[in-house]
């Protein structure tokens, strides 16, 4: 019996969770979709609309500033990661509507469901980079004055993207289409070819590198930052706290079900009742993780200091406001006004 995680996108589906027992039905044969699949479709639709529009707006707003403003570089990269993932949603949506039938071919099966994993790794690595930046602004302001520039920020983002691509490769490689006969359909999923150890290894690496390790390091990082900022009366900011909590918490909250079900399924036998139950929830877990792709613009842009006012103003006349807004750049250090302000305010915008 092969182990096949069919798609919803990667965890098989959209990713590689759905391990399919070949002697069990690939789905209920009724014409109606399961409740978890219906919920997933609703979430996908909302995420697509909000995510595409929101991230497109963020990209538009930040693209003009990204050559000079370091914060814009971070937000631009996060928005690009989210926007890319959102582009796969119509395909994933269609597949679920068709009871996980995948008529889009092998290349699409390898690439599209892997986008959410690329997003996961890119987002968490970019968040780690942003957190490091925040940390340095608080604890090494002099270093920042000398070395913190747009060039270094772009290099950090390039490294984050490179690592994200590298970490997405395993799911990409194991993703295959498979013809099913009872009922007739083509499934897209992850095939580990009987190798349960390999499946577990991929799930564990994903859990550790995409969730547990970042959770630990970001928690420590922000604990130090908040302790420092709270210790100075002038910088006690509830907005700061809200932004930090939203930034970190949203990522981990929305990825938690996916990660938990993924690790559980890698340790369960495909015929076990728990496995079959989790398998039915796979699309829903993936859709829940996808919420990250539309919530980031709201958190990082609307709530972020320096971008809140700009976004509000730019909605009626986006181009005019963005293009005419003044930025002060110090030639020697690629500094921006927001950088100077941030340090002057002792990281009020953490």
């Amino acid at each position: 019996m092969n182990s096949f995680n069919y798609t919803t996108p990667d965890y098989g589906h959209y990713d590689d969770k759905d391990t399919l027992d070949l002697n069990t039905p690939v789905d209920k044969t009724s014409n109606t979709l399961r409740v978890p699949d219906i919920l997933a479709l609703v979430i996908f639709a909302v995420v697509f609309l909000v995510g595409v529009l929101g991230n497109a707006l963020v990209v538009w707003v930040t693209a003009f500033e990204a050559k000079r403003t370091i914060n814009a570089i971070w937000f631009l990269n996060l928005a690009v990661a989210d926007f890319l993932s959102c582009l796969a949603l119509p395909i994933l949506f269609t597949s679920i509507v068709q009871h996980h039938h995948w008529p889009f071919g092998g290349a699409a099966c390898s690439i599209l469901p892997s986008l959410i994993l690329l997003n996961m790794y890119a987002s968490i690595l970019l968040l780690a980079t942003i957190s490091a930046d925040r940390f340095l602004l608080v604890f090494k302001p002099i270093w920042c004055q000398n070395f913190r520039g747009a060039g270094l920020a772009w290099i950090a983002c390039a490294v984050a993207w490179g690592l994200a691509l590298l970490l997405t490769i395993p799911s990409f490689l194991y993703r295959v289409v498979r013809e099913e006969y009872f009922p007739p359909k083509v499934l897209c999923g992850v095939d580990y070819s009987h190798d349960k150890r390999r499946e577990r290894a991929v799930a564990i690496v994903r859990l550790v590198l995409g969730f547990l390790w970042p959770l630990l390091t970001l928690t420590i990082c922000y604990t130090f930052i908040l302790l420092r900022t709270w210790s100075r009366r002038a910088t006690r900011s509830t907005k700061t706290l809200k932004v930090v909590v939203a930034v970190v918490a949203s990522f981990f909250i929305f990825w938690l079900p996916y990660q938990v079900t993924g690790i559980m399924m890698s340790f369960l036998e495909p015929s076990s009742p728990t496995f079959l139950l989790l398998n039915k929830l796979d699309s829903l877990c993936v859709s829940f993780a996808y919420i990250n792709c539309c919530i980031n613009p709201i958190i990082y842009v609307v709530a972020g200091q320096g971008f809140q006012g700009r976004l509000r103003k730019s909605l009626p006349s986006l181009l005019r406001n963005v293009l005419t807004e003044e930025s002060v750049v110090r030639e020697s250090k690629s500094f921006t006004r927001s950088t100077v302000d941030t340090m002057a305010q002792k990281t009020q915008a953490v």
């Epitope: 039905p25 044969t29 009724s30 009922p183």
Partner: antibody, heavy 116, light 107 residues
Framework: DVQLQESGPGLVKPSQSLSLTCTVT?????????WNWIRQFPGNKLEWMGY???????SYNPSLKSRISITRDTSKNQIFLQFNSVTTEDTAKYYC?????????WGQGTTLTVSS | DIQMTQSPSSLSASLGEKVSLTCRAS??????LSWLQQKPDGSIKRLIY???TLDSGVPKRFSGSRSGSVYSLTISSLESEDFADYYC?????????FGGGTKLEIR
């Protein structure tokens, strides 16, 4: 046109092992579809036994899983059904059939009689 | 496993007559149903798949329909070569199962 032809020993004794062959002509068994074994008992009841797909993936009827194996020889374009130990209850006519959307092509069948 | 209950088990009819055979599925099979014809020599041929789609080369007098969980095969005007055994088969999940068959005989 796709044609399937089954062949086998005809008569075997209980507890013996045996192999039935399905030779496919006019179509490559590795191009697509699944290649199935189905049997029909003396009372005319039909039972799906299992398949081997174009990619080599195998699926069995859970009721028979431990007793049979399905293999193939791609160079000869043949599918095989092996029994490790037959009983008189395995007396039936054995068909191979192609599955794409349901079973669209069937062989003529080969009769297997298990008797001491 | 899904049980396919086929009726009648045997049927006598005359040439030119219209006959209907039915098959009831114990669970939802969403139209994943075929009708098969088995001639006296044992050869099996598929007539209909997806409940109502006629296979190429099958005469138009054969038709398939569905009403809920009940599937029907109708022969509008019997001809001599139609007297044979007929089986329904679902392929909605594992394992696919067959109806018990209907023996169509000349009256």
């Amino acid at each position: 046109d796709v044609q399937l032809q089954e062949s086998g020993p005809g008569l075997v004794k209980p507890s013996q092992s045996l192999s039935l062959t399905c030779t496919v002509t006019g179509y490559s068994i590795t191009s697509d579809s699944a290649w199935n074994w189905i049997r029909q008992f003396p009372g005319n009841k039909l039972e799906w036994m299992g398949y081997i797909s174009y990619s080599g993936r195998i699926s069995y009827n859970p009721s028979l899983k431990s007793r049979i194996s399905i293999t193939r020889d791609t160079s000869k374009n043949q599918i095989f059904l092996q029994f490790n130990s037959v009983t008189t209850e395995d007396t039936a006519k054995y068909y191979c059939a192609r599955a794409s959307i349901g079973f669209d092509y069937w062989g003529q069948g080969t009769t297997l009689t298990v008797s001491s | 496993d899904i049980q396919m209950t086929q009726s009648p088990s045997s049927l006598s009819a005359s040439l030119g007559e219209k006959v209907s055979l039915t098959c009831r599925a114990s669970q939802e099979i969403s139209g994943y149903l075929s009708w098969l014809q088995q001639k006296p020599d044992g050869s099996i041929k598929r007539l209909i798949y997806a409940a109502s789609t006629l296979d190429s080369g099958v005469p138009k007098r054969f038709s398939g329909s569905r009403s809920g969980s009940v599937y029907s095969l109708t022969i509008s005007s019997l001809e001599s070569e139609d007297f044979a055994d007929y089986y329904c088969l679902h392929y909605a999940n594992y394992p696919p199962t067959f109806g018990g068959g209907t023996k169509l005989e000349i009256r």
